[in-house]
């Protein structure tokens, strides 16, 4: 029961986390810039991974996409890549984890298979979360180190044209969403990995023995399929008792006349 709860909670937490990573990646407010020296209207400038927006105090907002790849900074491209990898891994992890959930029955899937799938999805969630955290942190570092043109005054040398660069850049909401979402995905992944340990098939009480009926070439294995999985307590194939019953090794090693037709 605890294993199912841990697995289910891990799935839900990861689901929320991945939804957050997708939201952060699509958000425009990765970095924000306030302008105060404008006598016409207050202008609020903010940038995302895909486009830049300007909002006026009147409410008018204009957003334009980055239609060039060549002119984009390598760091921005790296952040994009990290976020996309995080989303893709997370999405695959979610798909795998749905089939791995203990509460969902799919055919005759064994607990060992579900355990493996849970572990796989858990690792995917962990990597996904780390990618998101790394991506957001790289972008935040770019802002902190004034990656965006930190020069106070730039003289172009053309007829006294002066460009005064404003650099009041602050962390946008997307950064915090990304950090939280990445953390949740990471936690969800850890929970899935923990749940995997509890899902691993335990040793059965069935004895892996073959009952040899005298005069008939019929092998009867109590417990059906599970008895032959090799997870029984009689793992060393020791002789249990005499009287027509032999271990599987013995049956194979010493064929009787009934074994051949």
């Amino acid at each position: 029961m605890a294993v199912t709860a841990c697995q289910g909670l891990g799935f839900v937490v990861s689901l929320i986390g991945i939804a957050g990573i997708i939201a952060a990646t699509c958000m425009d407010q990765w970095s924000t810039q306030d302008l105060y020296n404008n006598p016409v209207t207050a202008v609020f400038n903010y940038q995302g991974l895909w486009r830049s927006c300007v909002r006026e105090s009147s409410g008018f907002t204009e957003c334009r996409g980055y239609f060039t790849l060549l002119g984009l900074p390598a760091m921005l491209q790296a952040v994009r890549a990290l976020m996309i990898v995080g989303i893709v891994l997370g999405a695959i992890g979610l798909l795998v984890s749905i089939f791995a959930l203990k509460c969902i029955r799919i055919g005759s899937m064994e607990d060992s298979a579900k355990a493996n799938m849970t572990l796989t999805s858990g690792i995917m969630f962990i990597v996904s979360g780390l990618c998101a955290i790394a991506g957001v942190s790289v972008f935040a570092n770019m802002l902190v180190t004034n990656f965006w043109m930190s020069t106070a005054n730039m003289y172009t040398g053309m007829g006294g044209m002066v460009q005064t660069v404003q650099t009041r850049y602050t962390f946008g909401a997307a950064l915090f969403v990304g950090w939280v979402a990445g953390g949740l995905t990471l936690i969800g992944g850890v929970m899935m990995c923990i749940a995997c340990r509890g899902l691993a098939p335990e040793e059965t009480n069935y004895k892996a023995v073959s009952y040899h009926a005298s005069g008939h070439s019929v092998a009867y294995k109590p417990g059906g399929f599970k008895a032959s999985t090799g997870f029984g307590s009689n793992t060393k194939n020791k002789k249990i008792y005499d009287g027509g019953a032999r271990t599987e090794d013995e049956v194979q090693s010493y064929p009787s006349k009934h074994d051949y037709v």
């Epitope: 810039q33 016409v40 300007v54 009147s58 204009e62 002119g71 921005l76 044209m161």
Partner: nanobody, 121 residues
Framework: QVQLVESGGGLVQPGGSLRLSCAAS????????MTWYRQALGKEREFVAG???????NYADSVKGRFTVSRDNAKNTVYLQMNSLKSEDTAVYYC???????????????WGQGTLVTVSS
């Protein structure tokens, strides 16, 4: 890099009219606000009029009712229609644009080299 070029300045009699224009060119990503400033000889540069891309405009008290600012967003050009000109309007008129040359760069102040308007009889 964004370049601003002003034109339309010249000598005009008091009570006359002039139309200044300022065209932005170069690597332009976005120009939210375009503004006119002026600087008379021996005085500080002062705000005249400005207009945002959303259509919000503002004027200095000294030119209200006489000057009209307009903008052609498609051409990245701002105009200043000056009517009922007075001798105190004599100054070098500068065009200012708050713009970004690339979307991932912050908005910056770009200035033109100025055009001289002389109001004299």
């Amino acid at each position: 890099q964004v370049q601003l070029v002003e034109s339309g300045g010249g000598l005009v009699q008091p009570g006359g009219s002039l139309r200044l224009s300022c065209a932005a060119s170069g690597s332009i990503f976005s120009i939210p606000v375009m503004t006119w400033y002026r600087q008379a000889l021996g005085k500080e540069r002062e705000f005249v009029a400005g207009i945002s891309k959303g259509g919000t405009s503002n004027y200095a008290d000294s030119v209200k009712g006489r000057f009209t600012v307009s903008r052609d967003n498609a051409k990245n050009t701002v105009y200043l229609q000056m009517n009922s000109l007075k001798s105190e309007d004599t100054a070098v008129y500068y065009c200012n644009a708050q713009a970004s040359s690339f979307g991932w760069m912050p908005l910056s102040d770009y200035w033109g080299q100025g055009t001289l308007v002389t109001v004299s009889s």
